[in-house]
């Protein structure tokens, strides 16, 4: 499973993080590192 199951009490959303510190700055300048719906937001 790539995400939490609905039946486990977790509501599934689609969120992608810049997880590795070394990737910060190479992802469109995102410093917060939250990508929602394909758009990096701060």
């Amino acid at each position: 499973d790539a995400e939490f199951r609905h039946d486990s009490g977790y509501e599934v959303h689609h969120q992608k993080l810049v997880f590795f510190a070394e990737d910060v700055g190479s992802n469109k300048g995102a410093i917060i590192g939250l990508m929602v719906g394909g758009v990096v937001i701060a």
């Epitope: 992608k16 997880f19 070394e22 190479s26």
Partner: antibody, heavy 112, light 112 residues
Framework: EVQLVESGGGLVQPGGSLKLSCAAS????????MSWVRQTPDKRLELVAS????????YYPDSVKGRFTISRDNAKNTLYLQMSSLKSEDTAMYYC?????WGQGSTLTVSS | DVVMTQTPLSLPVSLGDQASISCRSS???????????LHWYLQKPGQSPKLLIY???SRFSGVPDRFSGSGSGTDFTLKISRVEAEDLGVYFC?????????FGGGTKLEIK
């Protein structure tokens, strides 16, 4: 929906080779570093290879250096792990991971 | 490599109790941008690890607010305010500030 789906695991004899693949979807694959992490029978997690977003930089621990090669095809949204000179201690569940998401895992058993 | 040390190894709890897991790193996890890349996963039997908390205290999408993370520098804690049956499994801390990505040895949360 972010998905990482591994394939290619199996039973291999010591000294043999195997290539794992990981098909990614639901995110801009080419923007993210990716890794292969293995979970040994004692349940410990160990990074075995990582690669940056454009494939220009890789990392391997000493335990697999010279035997494992990580690569990626950003046009195909696919991550690979070529393993050779396999040893019994490489027996593990191998996960493709972006850190926040992990695949379901692919089992490698090295045994004669 | 950064060594991640988790305690306890096993944590027996009663449902409804609070649980607390400690994670210490062998060096500071503060990155040059001021962020601290310390994360917590839960792995249930037969599943891959799932991200719960990222960057010390941010809950990943869909994670209940009974999970909370705290700490700084080299000393971190995961708290579960009221343990439910679905929370049982093995918890891992992890750092991605430094290369290579490293993991704690795991803490098994089980019923007392």
């Amino acid at each position: 929906e972010v998905q990482l789906v591994e394939s290619g695991g199996g039973l291999v004899q010591p000294g043999g080779s195997l290539k794992l693949s990981c098909a990614a979807s639901g995110f801009t694959f080419s923007s993210y570093g990716m890794s292969w992490v293995r979970q040994t029978p004692d349940k410990r997690l160990e990074l075995v290879a990582s690669i940056n977003s454009n494939g220009g930089s890789t990392y391997y621990p000493d335990s697999v250096k010279g035997r494992f090669t990580i690569s990626r095809d950003n046009a195909k949204n696919t991550l690979y792990l070529q393993m050779s000179s396999l040893k019994s201690e490489d027996t593990a569940m191998y996960y493709c991971a972006s850190g926040d998401y992990w695949g379901q895992g692919s089992t490698l058993t090295v045994s004669s | 490599d950064v060594v991640m040390t988790q305690t306890p190894l096993s944590l027996p709890v009663s449902l409804g109790d609070q649980a607390s897991i400690s994670c210490r790193s062998s060096q500071s996890l503060v990155y040059s941008n001021g962020d601290t890349y310390l994360h917590w996963y839960l792995q249930k039997p037969g599943q891959s690890p799932k991200l719960l908390i990222y960057k010390v205290s941010s809950r990943f999408s869909g994670v209940p607010d009974r999970f909370s993370g705290s700490g700084s520098g080299t000393d971190f804690t995961l708290k579960i305010s009221r343990v439910e049956a679905e929370d049982l499994g093995v918890y891992f801390c992890s750092q991605s500030t430094h290369v290579p990505w490293t993991f704690g040895g795991g803490t098994k949360l089980e019923i007392k």
